[in-house]
Interface confidence: low
């Protein structure tokens, strides 16, 4: 009579986290007599995965009665599968011996490989916000998938990125693996508005990528301009000086007004105008009693935006002679420079 | 058995390549990934790279970037590595071990090859 | 890259003696460490794997621990089987390293 074999007719199988592997497997003959054991690699190390005379295997199932004489299928189920699962299982018939069985022979192997989904990419951004024409890195993770290839790509507005470096870990064998990336974006000041997605695409989601997305409202901070102007005179002696806010963001702006050097007004931004770019505009006046000042006065107009260094503008107003026309300080933002001849 | 059976003994010139090979058998090959490791006459070890035969997929120590070169042959259940640009430094035994790709702890760099030795001498 | 650093890097010990090999791992390393055996002329075997975890065919005198990013391998008895070289392995993060290993000589 022919040697007994044992077949496993599946090179390999793939399997989809969470459902239930079938590993296939028949002996051709009867003889000798002994039990079947599964096991998962070869050699030292190897896993005991079922054994069919002892033993307590709550997520593998027999395909078929595998107490009854005759039977020669030795097939089992899986369930729940995990990318820890993933392997070279062997079916291995054993002789019945004394004291202990003997491993006869072994099936060739069913490789199982598992299908595990990404999770949901994770970006974030830096820790603290940038303005326009800096440079900002942002993060996207995303893990526990199984096979390693996947694809990552970068986009701002719906427009690819190409300045990003992409890892994969770990770089040896895992049951499962990570992506980590992290994107390179120039900000600009129209970009209160703007998004970055990441996109991984993984053979596990059938061609309808994951998205990660951050807003760059949560990133970018517009530092405003500053203009100082004087208003038209209201009665002979108070003059109506206005310091025009602009395009800043976030909201977070606190004002002060200076006369001289001194304290005259504190105020914090509140009823706010928003632009169509997202960010801000706001307006602060001040209204100056000239006769109350025997000598020019130095209306100075100081903004501290979320936190940074004040920046400001000057206006003198002359009170040595009487109101002619109206006038505004448009000098450099920053460099405290006066307009004079106001009066 | 699982057994890694490694090419035979080298002697090569400065400035050559040489390829060697790692054959395995008694189990299924495309299941691990191949690693190689490097070790000096009278020094202890060291990993060069590994690379996965189901894609061909590597991963080198970045020391051994340019030096070495990985590659597969899945129907010959084989292996191969390449050294370049040969000195006397790379006079060495080379190694092949086996790990299981799937497993996190117990399979990592369970079977080892005989080893090949390579002397480069003029 | 992980350094391993190994001690001592030769001993001299009888047979039946108790000892012990330590590497220190330059980071953590979780428990992802084996330690292998190397006799002249002899394919290189893995004793030990996952810190302690002995391999199937590996005598019991054979054992591993680890406190933080220390680890030991310890022979409780000493056959004349047992002289050989020893290394770990780090294998949690690539590049994998190896201790400098520890030649175990006869007295």
């Known amino acids: 009579e022919e040697e007994l074999q044992v077949i496993q007719p599946d090179k390999s199988v793939l399997v989809a986290a969470g459902e239930t592997a079938t590993l296939r497997c028949t002996a051709t003959s009867l003889i000798p007599v002994g039990p079947i054991q599964w096991f998962r690699g070869a050699g030292p190390g190897r896993e005991l995965i079922y054994n069919q005379k002892e033993g307590h295997f709550p997520r593998v199932t027999t395909v078929s009665d595998l107490t009854k004489r005759n039977n020669m299928d030795f097939s089992i189920r899986i369930g729940n599968i995990t990318p820890a699962d993933a392997g070279t299982y062997y079916c291995v018939k054993f002789r019945k011996g004394s004291p202990d069985d003997v491993e006869f022979k072994s099936g060739a192997g069913t490789e199982l490989s598992v299908r595990a989904k990404p999770s949901a990419p994770v970006v974030s951004g830096p820790a603290a916000r940038a303005t326009p024409q800096h440079t900002v890195s942002f993060t996207c993770e995303s893990h526990g998938f199984s096979p390693r290839d996947i694809t990552l790509k970068w986009f701002k507005n719906g427009n690819e990125l190409s300045d990003f470096q992409t890892n994969v870990d770990p770089v040896g064998e895992s049951v499962s693996y990570s992506i980590h990336s992290t994107a390179k974006v120039v900000l600009t000041r129209e970009d209160v508005h703007s998004q970055v997605i990441c996109e991984v695409a993984h053979v596990t989601l059938q061609g309808d990528p994951l998205r990660g997305t951050a807003n760059l409202s949560e990133t970018i901070r517009v530092p405003p301009t500053l203009e100082v102007t004087q208003q038209p005179v209201r009665a002979e002696n108070q003059v109506n000086v206005t310091c025009q806010v602009r395009k800043f963001y976030p909201q977070r702006l606190q004002l002060t007004w200076l006369e001289n050097g001194n304290v005259s007004r504190t105020e914090t931004a509140s009823t706010v105008t928003e632009n169509k770019d997202g960010t801000y505009n706001w307006m602060s006046w001040l209204l100056v009693n000239v006769s109350a000042h025997r000598d020019d006065v130095k209306l100075t107009c100081q903004v501290e935006h979320d936190g940074q260094p004040a920046v400001s503008k000057s206006h003198d107003l002359k009170v040595s002679a009487h109101p002619k026309e109206q006038g505004s300080n448009t000098a450099a933002e920053n460099t405290g420079s006066n307009e004079r001849n106001i009066y | 058995e699982v057994q890694l059976v490694q090419s035979g003994a080298e002697v090569v010139k400065p400035g050559a390549s040489v390829k060697l090979s790692c054959k395995a058998s008694?189990?299924?090959?495309?299941?691990?990934?191949m690693h190689w490791v490097k070790q000096a006459p009278g020094q202890g070890l060291e990993w060069i790279g590994a690379?996965?035969?189901?894609?061909?997929?590597?991963t080198y120590n970045q020391k051994f970037k340019g030096k070495a070169t990985l590659t597969v042959d899945k129907s010959a259940s084989t292996a191969y590595m390449e050294l370049s640009s040969l000195r006397s430094e790379d006079t060495a035994v080379y190694y092949c071990?086996?790990?299981?790709?799937?497993?996190?702890?117990?399979?990592?760099?369970?079977?080892w090859g005989q080893g090949t030795l390579v002397t480069v001498s003029s | 890259d992980i350094q391993m650093t190994q001690s001592p890097s030769s001993l001299s010990a009888s047979v039946g003696d108790r000892v012990t090999i330590t590497c220190r791992a330059s980071?953590?390393?979780?428990?992802?460490l084996n330690w292998l055996q190397q006799k002249p002329g002899k394919a290189i075997k893995r004793l030990i794997y996952?810190?302690?975890s002995l391999d199937s065919g590996v005598p019991s005198r054979f054992s591993g621990s680890r406190s933080g990013t220390d680890f030991t391998l310890t022979i409780s008895s000493l056959q004349p089987e047992d002289f050989a070289t020893y290394y770990c392995?780090?294998?949690?993060?690539?590049?994998?390293?190896f201790g400098g290993g520890t030649k175990l000589e006869i007295k």
């Open positions: 008694g189990s299924t090959f495309t299941s691990y990934w």
């Open positions: 980071q953590d390393i979780g428990s992802r």
């Open positions: 996952a810190t302690s």
């Open positions: 392995l780090q294998y949690a993060s690539s590049p994998f390293t």
């Open positions: 071990t086996r790990s299981f790709y799937y497993s996190l702890d117990a399979a990592w760099f369970v079977y």
């Open positions: 690379i996965y035969p189901v894609n061909s997929d590597t």
